[in-house]
């Protein structure tokens, strides 16, 4: 429970007062307001929304609300020269063309400035050639193609289904395989849940629906032209040839009606197994090229998008802390959308808006949080987390000294089944305690806690009676705060039943059909799940900003470090002969983890006993907690990924969305049996064990008694 002592406020102004002020009806109203027109990054419409949010946050009572602008590289289709893909015959005539735009949803037929589906940052080009179907274009899919099936993608146009991994990883894999173009499509197996109708009659993807998205491989760099530094007025920009993370081959997304027309003619090899088959009525032949009758036909891409340096705007609101104004708790989520943003991001932005309103109401009644709370409406998240990253680069010195925690607030829902939380282990106990105090919105759990319904529906694979909490990966605005700066971070949203719905994300993700009506009719008519997410996100911010002792439990880090060390050791032990030959030992890592466990335990004991009325000792203990996450940062970063600096967690090298533990060791071990120089490869494994062991030991020592 929060204490009120430090901020001299009446008992009324506690967590309960904050939570009771949050209203589902307000979230609904805000969502409607934010979703009536597109708010694409870099457009006038999104600038106007930034100014509206700035104005409303001021009205709600924040101390200051400023716009922070940057000039970053964005990507747009050419309005007069549309992107499309053709099937061409031997004479070069286009006998089939993919669609130029999605059929607009009912009621939106006359809306202007709906950007047609495109892969942001695709280079221009008109490659033509034979098609190869590459399943999800994952690392293992290309291994299957190249190593097992002996199929060469060099000089081919590959077609890959969306899902399983971040689309940028698919494009990177295709490039490395030598492809000269990539077609991405949504297969009904992944984006059409059985027994549900297509939009507008249900929440499934219609055949003309297409997923937009960027295809960068930024690895945390932010603006591709100014890696490491803010894209401000005096920025030095790289040339486009030196830009970070840009794809080198044309890429374009299509829906399943168009995919059907491309895939139905495929010849060549049969799919290797059933995991390569989707739900279309096509053979899912791998190719290369079309079958017999159509073997002279080719596929041609026509991509004319342009990359442009464009101004973007973050909104930054401040609620100054009464006791520790130099300690920052940040709640941030993005504002830019691909089209209407009914779920992504405005279901999150509407929740942030209501959280700001509730905090503002308390402030107007005389309350202040103990610590400063910063609220952020990020721009250009969809173009590579650009707004949040540029702001963090500009303010990195303040953040690394003063940043207590970052809570992310993108989409509040991706389903309506149960809670989903990804966070640092430091926040596990905070999340558990908070959800025990909140009511479950789920049917069949009336009068029960959110913790109870969450644990029942999404149990922890390791600890009975506890809910699953996942590792942080990336693909959202917490990335720079956690992976680069080492600020304790977390995110929460309502999700689907992963057991019964094995499609990727939600079906209408990044399509024109992500509307207000999608949410209001099909996902959350009462906005009760949105309200619950507001309570979780807002409650976390409240506790982090207001509790006298920071609600971090370092013992939970000790538990996961042991688990991650066991896991990486077992991966390495798949090569017992090489471990012996090259004298690979994990003793240093296990020793460091043991030391961390003991020191964390002693620190926790001291935390129970120290004199909380002594502000110096209190600040000292809190600083040790705040800086623990920072202690896992290696200033040199991970190999070839300088902006991923957290030694315990990084986005997977094979899927940006997923988190990997001990990523340095993991990557060194990955596919090690295929390395041309095993001695060098195992040497790198040993180096990464050394880095990890040192970092864990160093982090442990930050929790030791200071003198």
């Amino acid at each position: 429970k929060s204490s009120n002592e430090a901020t001299n406020i009446t008992p009324k102004h506690n967590m309960k007062a904050f939570l009771d002020e949050l209203k589902a009806e307000n979230i609904k109203k805000f969502l409607y307001n934010f979703t009536q027109i597109p708010h694409l990054a870099g457009t006038e419409q999104n600038f106007q929304l930034a100014k509206q949010i700035q104005s409303q946050w001021k009205e709600f009572g924040l101390d200051s609300v400023e716009l922070a602008h940057y000039d970053v590289l964005l990507s747009y289709p050419n309005k007069t020269h549309p992107n499309y893909i053709s099937i061409i015959n031997e004479d070069g005539n286009e006998i089939f063309n993919t669609s130029l735009f999605e059929p607009p949803p009912p009621g939106y037929e006359n809306v202007s400035d709906i950007v047609p589906p495109f892969s942001a940052f695709s280079p221009q080009g008109m490659p033509e050639g034979d098609l190869v179907y590459v399943n999800y274009a994952r690392t293992e899919d290309f291994f299957k193609l190249e190593r097992d099936m002996k199929i060469n993608c060099s000089g081919k146009i590959v077609i890959a289904r969306y899902g399983k991994v971040f689309r940028g990883n698919k494009v990177k894999n295709a490039q490395l395989a030598g492809a000269k173009g990539v077609i991405l499509y949504s297969d009904p197996a992944d984006y059409f849940a059985p027994g549900v109708k297509s939009y507008p009659d249900g929440w499934n993807l219609p055949g003309g629906g297409v997923q937009r998205g960027n295809i960068l491989n930024l690895n945390g760099a932010g603006d591709p032209l100014t890696p490491g530094y803010p894209a401000n007025e005096y920025a030095y920009r790289r040339g486009i040839a030196e830009a970070v993370g840009l794809p080198s081959i044309p890429v374009h997304p299509i829906g399943y009606y168009d995919a059907q027309k491309l895939l139905e003619k495929m010849g060549g090899s049969a799919p290797p197994d059933s995991s390569w088959r989707g739900s279309l009525k096509v053979p899912y032949n791998v190719g290369p090229g079309f079958t017999g009758n159509f073997s002279t036909q080719k596929v041609k891409m026509h991509i004319h998008s342009t990359n442009e340096v464009t101004r973007i705007y973050n909104v930054i609101g401040t609620l100054r802390g009464a006791v520790e104004p130099d300690r920052y708790v940040i709640l941030g989520g993005h504002r830019d959308s691909w089209v209407f943003g009914g779920i992504d991001p405005q279901s999150g932005a509407a929740v942030v808006h209501e959280i700001v309103r509730s905090f503002g109401t308390l402030k107007k009644e005389g309350w202040r949080p103990r610590r400063t709370i910063l609220f952020a409406s990020w721009d250009a998240e969809e173009f590579g987390l650009l707004g949040s990253t540029e702001w963090a680069e500009e303010n990195s010195r303040l953040l690394q000294e003063r940043g207590v925690a970052y809570i992310n607030a993108d989409s509040s829902i991706e389903g309506n089944y149960t809670l989903r939380v990804d966070c640092t282990p430091l926040m596990y106990s905070l999340v558990h305690n908070l959800t025990k105090e909140l009511k479950s919105p789920d049917e069949g759990f009336e009068g029960k806690s959110l913790y109870e319904s969450w644990t029942k529906k999404s149990p922890s694979p390791e600890f009975s009676g506890m809910p699953r909490i996942s590792k942080l990966g990336s693909g959202n605005d917490f990335e720079v705060f956690f992976q680069r700066l080492g600020i304790a971070s977390g995110r929460a949203r309502y999700t689907k039943n992963w057991e019964t719905n094995k499609f990727s994300g939600y079906p209408l993700y990044h399509s024109v059909y992500e509307t207000y009506e999608l949410v209001e009719k099909f996902y959350d008519p009462m906005f009760k799940y949105h309200l619950t997410v507001a309570q979780v996100r807002g409650g976390m911010v409240f506790e982090l900003a207001n509790s006298i002792v920071l609600p971090f439990d370092c013992r939970d880090y000790a538990v996961v470090l042991r688990k991650y060390a066991d896991k990486i050791y077992s991966i390495s032990m798949k090569h017992p002969q090489e471990m012996k030959t090259y004298s690979v030992s994990f003793d240093s890592l296990f020793s460091a983890v043991k030391n961390f466990t003991e020191i964390a335990s002693k620190f926790s004991e001291r935390l129970q006993d120290f004199d909380k009325s002594n502000p110096i000792v209190l600040r000292m203990m809190n600083d040790q907690l705040m800086f623990l996450e920072r202690a896992f940062i290696d200033p040199l970063g991970l190999p070839d990924r300088p902006f991923y600096r957290h030694v315990i967690y990084a986005p997977s090298s094979h899927n940006k969305y997923a988190g990997e533990s001990f990523p340095g060791i993991y990557d060194a071990l990955f596919d090690i049996e295929s390395k041309v120089d095993p001695s060098k490869a195992w040497g790198e494994v040993k180096r990464q064990i050394y880095v990890a062991a040192f970092t864990v030991q160093a982090a442990a020592e930050t929790l030791s008694e200071v003198a």
Partner: nanobody
């Protein structure tokens, strides 16, 4: 009320041109593929042409290929059929018909028809 209204028919000499229009109301033309279908006197229905909702693909019956052009103006909620080099065998009532599937890439079943406009090709 959902309806399609054809216009532009008439009597024309062989070798001349005619342009048919089809005005849609009560539904958004922009979301649907559209067809022209004809019925010659005493004969069954013949499909003539199809255009996808976005205009990216056009398909024609072999008998009209190279002579007829289907087009659309989604902003005006109107479908067109430009008929050149008309022949006596093109004499028919011409109907526009809405495809039933949103976003279809090839002709499917029709679910809304116009009342038709008569084209007579005669010297």
């Amino acid at each position: 009320e959902v309806q399609l209204v054809e216009s532009g028919g008439g009597v024309v000499q062989p070798g001349r041109s005619l342009r048919l229009s089809c005005a849609a109301s009560g539904f958004p033309l922009i979301s649907y593929g559209m067809n022209w279908v004809r019925q010659a006197p005493g004969k069954g229905l013949d499909w003539v042409a199809f255009i996808t909702y976005d205009g990216s693909n056009r398909y024609y019956a072999d008998s009209v290929k190279g002579r007829f052009t289907i087009s659309r103006d989604n902003s005006k909620n109107t479908l067109y059929l430009q008929m050149n080099s008309l022949r006596p065998e093109d004499t028919a009532v011409y109907y526009c018909a809405k495809d039933r599937i949103v976003g279809a890439r090839v002709p499917d079943a029709y679910d809304i028809w116009g009342q038709g406009t008569l084209v007579t090709v005669s010297s």
